[in-house]
Amino acid sequence: APRGTQAEESPFVGNPGNITGARGLTGTLRCQLQVQGEPPEVHWLRDGQILELADSTQTQVPLGEDEQDDWIVVSQLRITSLQLSDTGQYQCLVFLGHQTFVSQPGYVGLEGLPYFLEEPEDRTVAANTPFNLSCQAQGPPEPVDLLWLQDAVPLATAPGHGPQRSLHVPGLNKTSSFSCEAHNAKGVTTSRTATITVLPQQPRNLHLVSRQPTELEVAWTPGLSGIYPLTHCTLQAVLSDDGMGIQAGEPDPPEEPLTSQASVPPHQLRLGSLHPHTPYHIRVACTSSQGPSSWTHWLPVETPEGVPLGPPENISATRNGSQAFVHWQEPRAPLQGTLLGYRLAYQGQDTPEVLMDIGLRQEVTLELQGDGSVSNLTVCVAAYTAAGDGPWSLPVPLEAWRPGQAQPVHQLVKEPSTPAFSWPWW
């Protein structure tokens, strides 16, 4: 019968030792047994549970020439980079015949400098705005005391008086570094150093100062920026679109915004070369040497209507007896709003001017008084929007109409000069 088949006779001649060390340590546990006959497979237990994926090696040495002679079996369990999860009671286990044998236990313990589970992270904060930082460390040995540092200077050092895992900072006015030190019976470890960058606060009260058809003047109140003066503010504008869905807090519009920089102070900017009677969304952020603030919410604004920038085109006026037929086309120049209609004025050499509102039609037949005897009759036309009348056309003389002839068309030879229209405005 193989050695160790009786319950009281253990085959183990060497039991696992003890390992105590710091995180990252590499160590080996070893157990040795002497058996008669075929050597068994050695299993390792941690806290009574078989380790399925153990990094173990087994060496078997026969003590005789016969298979039934004794064998020395050595099993080694390698622990690489010791962690808290490796700690516990270790034993070897073998099955011999119908019996199970377990070695005496060895213990693996972790003891060293504090180990950081959480360290303060770099972040940006608005000036004078509260925030929290986290730091967490563990042993063993416990307890672990934390000491918070700002710019490497302790914040609270009296035991039990300082903050532990979470540090509440009521606000900063300058970019600062924060770290924590963890103290236990084995020593002190310093965390990484987190840089907290102080950015300007978000500007407030973005509003319109004045509106013109192609120009908006906007102003805002800057937020606090700590010890760092603001260098400039950046305004973004985007053409509004009903389907665009810019909400108050929506971070970005779906199309590329158009950007303009403003020197500060004053905290004001004139946006020119805009489309009249057009909705926009605008927002502003201000920048210091440390970086930009967050953007304000998108503010919906709209340029007002303007008057048409040019007169109606291709005006023709023909006369047939006591009737005059006048025809024109919409102005080629920008209307700067919604066209509400046309006004027409006609006048003879010695007669008072007659003014008519034609509405949106582009032709009219005039009934002339005095049986058409009025001489040198001329016609002018202007387009208008809600903002008022655009420029009048040059006077067009009434031509006599002869059957078989096309109605004469008078091209305007001179128009009021239109302002140069350029997009974008920045």
Partner: antibody
Framework: EVQLVESGGGLVQPGGSLRLSCAAS????????IHWVRQAPGKGLEWVAG????????YYADSVKGRFTISADTSKNTAYLQMNSLRAEDTAVYYC????????????WGQGTLV | DIQMTQSPSSLSASVGDRVTITCRAS??????VAWYQQKPGKAPKLLIY???FLYSGVPSRFSGSGSGTDFTLTISSLQPEDFATYYC?????????FGQGTKVEIK
Amino acid sequence: EVQLVESGGGLVQPGGSLRLSCAASGFTFTGTGIHWVRQAPGKGLEWVAGIPPVGSYTYYADSVKGRFTISADTSKNTAYLQMNSLRAEDTAVYYCARWRSLSSGMDYWGQGTLV
Amino acid sequence: DIQMTQSPSSLSASVGDRVTITCRASQDVSTAVAWYQQKPGKAPKLLIYSASFLYSGVPSRFSGSGSGTDFTLTISSLQPEDFATYYCQQSKTTPPTFGQGTKVEIK
């Protein structure tokens, strides 16, 4: 004005004992610790022991562990270094320095005492 | 323990020179490095802490930089009173360990 003054140095036989004192003024030991640093003749600086500003721990260099003991009497604002089983290689000027935090560096030092 | 290796061990320089001393840690110490100046027969004086913070009262010609394992102390324009021995020290963990020192001598 912050000041640290060491005393207690002197000539001692190998195997003998000495107790160094470090009297602090201008600050209190509450929330502050003390380092002991030594400098052998013509050599560099070597940290010996320390009491940190938090907890109730004491730390030692491996070279003195089991032989030296650091302590502090907050009522007297004085730190001590009890040195037993002294060896020839312990010969040095011993400085005490303030320990506010490890990261802050040793910002105030005493003038040193020769052992 | 973390080893701190300073270079050079000594250097000769003239007043007005720019002097650079380097220190290398045997493992990452983040920015936990201090620099000290020591004159013969005197206690060391703190110059720089946390790698780059100038200690109160130290002239601005002294500056520190670096993180991880490589650190530098720079004296932008050497003055007569700057001839001394300079030590780096890691403060990442206990035991705090010092470099072997760099002696700055008059050329």
